[in-house]
């Protein structure tokens, strides 16, 4: 018996199709993803194959306009509208809080969604029962396969799920619901998870009875032979894992921003058991033709997202210098600003000796495009913020060394004067650069915001010591020469929208005034 | 021990309607679906319908598909068969049975409860 | 619809002897073919499911093959409690249907 599995995982918003970068579509002859385009890919396969699931591994929310605007209910609608048929629970799902979940997603989604490892207690217990599941069986054709869901433990950390949902491991988690499973005669599991690539093949390896897992989290781009596009493979897909009770176990995952539909075909014998998997992420380029209905609804709910940019969301009454001429040379405020908002997004309270889970912020002065002007009756529209931070980026929360740090600040001033993108903007971070020293060793002195305090103050970095820090994902990536970040970074998760975690400061603020207050000198 | 009891059983006149139901413990009545078979006095068995395990599909045999409608409530362990514009051909015994296979184990099986449409 | 026939209609054999019962679809059923036993004012009693595997508490004189469009249920020695009508039972894309029954009498 053979199963096509297509799945899409950390979408993040990207209903209309996008450059090949996954930001804004400019030249639509040379666009990809998009619900649409995505609708006729899967309605293609399904006239053609008897057996088809869509599956998403979770991110639907956060990351354009579309979800500042509908909070949500762009997803359930337009994943109604693809009839997809189970969607796992991801760390963004939470970011406006559990009630930013239940009543447009959860309450609205025609599919089921899924995760056995969120256990909801207190008095959200009740208001959450069956909104959401730890399994769900599913017909196939004439047969049954069982679709057990996970979320990325780290969520607490990640976004806003309050205190009355507790993330229990997703192995620990997963093997019970697995087993009742298997005692109702499901002998067809298929693991729909959002914990990132390592956790997806641990799982593969340790919950006895997973047949298959579709993850996502980690934005992973797995491909058998030349690849389509600029996304280099993480590994073969499927990326096949050993469990430890000598099974094969396809995982996969479809990159990220609905760039590619995932397609996986498994033959399973009677018993259940997947007797072969093969397939490939088909990329959704424009030779694929958005459906034209898909295309019309699309444009019927971007009409509100055209009048939701020249909204005032807040006030400056200072002006917010973003120029490359400040931010690439010296503290901005447009960067302090940038960076207090991000401090700001991911306040977490975590526990009685912690203040927050982070305190610091870098930020490249070359990713800050535009100074506002506040001369224009201090307004501050979404609009003017796009002009601020236009590549479509991302605010990720990153771990890494004292000394991973101290080399960032390293490189941050190696070739200064250029007017180079390199120039770090900084929060939770005191430092004071030698330019008569030579490249390589003009940081003199390096403090950061203590997290383990009752009252934040500022110390010496440690080289050793390991840290939380918020930052672009451009840069989590090696961007601007920030190699030994993407090199040495001892975890990564990505984060909300850049656009969004400034316009949600600025509208929470309400009237802003930045100063430059000395977070970087020069001695 | 497993136990289904169906009741709401009866006369009715052809047009009319009436709900049946089935009284379920002794298991975990939110695993499992659930169906509707009927016999008519004398003949063979009839698949009427089925509901999956959180009500999230059903399935009808064509002979009362948009007359008949399977429901259930699992924070009352019942299963309920509403049927609308009866016939004379519905008069049968209907038997609440459990699946414990999807589809390919009906394993157990109420007493039955008997409907009879006649004017 | 898939249709099933049940041959032969009567079946009649003395308590001991060996009982052979078909049950042959209009198309392919795969494995999905169930066997009932029904006795006269009782509800029905699952025998075999999956064409072969024996339900629970159900004696090892009652045994299931075929597949495909063919199939048979066996009654190795017939006791005096086997005396029923045995029905088979399909599924194909969530749609049910029963044999019209072999009635097992005593000769």
């Known amino acids: 018996w053979e199963l096509t599995i297509l799945h899409t995982n950390d979408v993040h918003s990207r209903l209309e199709q996008t450059s090949e970068d996954s930001s804004k579509c400019v030249n639509a002859s040379r666009c990809m993803g998009g619900v649409a385009r995505l609708f006729t890919k899967v309605q293609q396969i399904r006239r053609a194959e008897p057996n088809v699931l869509l599956l998403d591994a979770g991110d639907q929310y956060q990351g354009t306009i579309w979800f500042t605007v509908y909070k949500g209910a762009e997803v359930a609608h337009f994943m109604n509208a693809l009839r997809y048929d189970a969607m796992a629970l991801g760390n963004h799902e939470f970011d406006n809080g559990v009630e930013g979940l239940i009543e447009p997603l959860l309450k609205e989604a025609k599919f089921p969604i899924l995760s056995a490892n969120i256990k909801a207690k207190g008095p959200l217990a009740s208001q959450i029962s069956g909104l959401y599941l730890p399994y769900k069986v599913l017909p196939v054709g004439d047969e049954v396969v069982g679709i057990v869901g996970y979320t990325s433990k780290e969520t607490p950390f990640l976004s806003n799920p309050g205190t009355n949902l507790v993330f229990e491991d997703e192995i620990t988690a997963l093997q019970p619901e697995v087993d009742k499973l298997k005692t109702l005669n499901v002998n067809k599991i298929i693991a729909l998870g959002h914990s990132g690539f390592e956790t997806d093949k641990l799982i593969a390896q340790k919950v006895r009875g997973v047949d298959v897992v579709v993850g996502g989290h980690s934005n992973t781009f797995l491909y058998t032979g030349n690849p389509p596009s600029k996304e280099v493979p993480a590994g073969k897909y499927p990326f096949i894992v050993t469990s430890d009770d000598g099974r094969k176990v396809p995982v996969v995952q479809a990159y990220a921003f609905g760039k590619y539909l995932g397609y996986l075909k498994i033959e399973f014998d009677e018993r259940g058991n997947v007797i072969s998997s093969h397939g490939n992420p088909i990329l959704l380029n424009s030779s694929i033709p958005e459906d034209p209905s898909i295309k019309a609804d699309i444009n019927k709910w971007r009409i509100k997202l055209d009048n939701y940019s020249t909204q005032e969301l807040g006030k400056t009454i200072v002006y917010l210098d973003g120029s490359s001429q400040s931010c690439r040379f010296r503290e901005c405020n447009m960067g302090n600003l940038i960076c207090d908002a991000m401090i700001n997004n991911n306040l977490r309270h975590a526990d009685e000796m912690f203040w927050n889970h982070v305190s610091m912020c870098i930020l490249n002065g070359g990713g800050i495009r535009s100074p506002i002007d506040e001369r224009n009756n201090g307004t501050i529209t979404w609009e003017n913020l796009a002009a601020v931070l236009p590549f479509g980026g991302t605010f990720d929360l990153v771990q890494l060394k004292g000394s991973t740090l101290k080399k960032a600040f390293e490189h941050s001033v190696h070739r200064y004067g250029q007017s180079t993108g390199e120039f770090l903007q900084v929060g939770g971070i005191h430092v004071v650069y030698d330019l008569s020293r030579k490249p390589g060793d003009r940081v003199v002195k390096l403090d950061v915001l203590c997290t383990k305090c009752r009252v934040p103050s500022y110390d010496p970095l440690k080289m050793d010591e390991i840290y939380k820090v918020i930052l672009p994902n451009f840069l989590a990536n090696g961007g601007d020469g920030f190699q030994m970040i993407k090199d040495e970074l001892l975890r990564h998760d990505s984060g909300d929208q850049d656009i969004n975690v400034v316009s949600t400061y600025i509208s929470k603020m309400k009237v802003i005034y930045p100063a430059v207050e000395g977070r970087i000198k020069f001695s | 021990q497993v136990q289904l009891v169906e009741s709401g059983g009866g006369v009715a006149q052809p047009g009319r309607s009436l709900s049946l139901s089935c009284a379920a413990s002794?298991?975990?009545?939110?695993?499992?679906?659930m169906h509707w078979v009927r016999q008519a006095p004398g003949k063979g068995l009839e698949w009427v319908a089925l509901?999956?395990?959180?009500?999230?599909?059903?399935y009808y045999a064509d002979s009362v598909k948009g007359r008949f409608s399977i429901s259930r409530d699992n924070s009352k362990n019942t299963l309920y068969l509403q049927m609308n514009s009866l016939r004379a051909e519905d008069t049968a015994v209907y038997y609440c049975?459990?699946?414990?296979?999807?589809?390919?184990?009906?394993?157990?099986w109420g007493q039955g409860t008997l409907v009879t449409v006649s004017s | 619809e898939i249709v099933l026939t049940q041959s032969p209609a009567t079946l009649s054999l003395s308590p001991g002897e060996r009982a052979t019962l078909s049950c042959r679809a209009s198309q392919s059923v795969s494995r999905y073919l169930a066997w009932y036993q029904q006795k006269p004012g009782q509800a029905p009693r699952l025998l075999i499911y999956d064409a072969s595997n024996r339900a629970t508490g159900i004696p090892a004189r009652f045994s299931g093959s075929g597949s495909g469009t063919d199939f048979t249920l066996t009654i190795s020695s017939l006791e005096p409690e086997d005396f029923a009508v045995y029905y088979c039972q399909q599924r194909s894309n969530w749609i049910f249907t029963f044999g019209p029954g072999t009635k097992v009498d005593i000769k």
């Open positions: 002794g298991f975990t009545f939110s695993d499992y679906g």
């Open positions: 049975v459990r699946d414990a296979q999807w589809g390919s184990r009906l394993d157990y």
């Open positions: 509901i999956w395990y959180d009500a999230s599909f059903e």
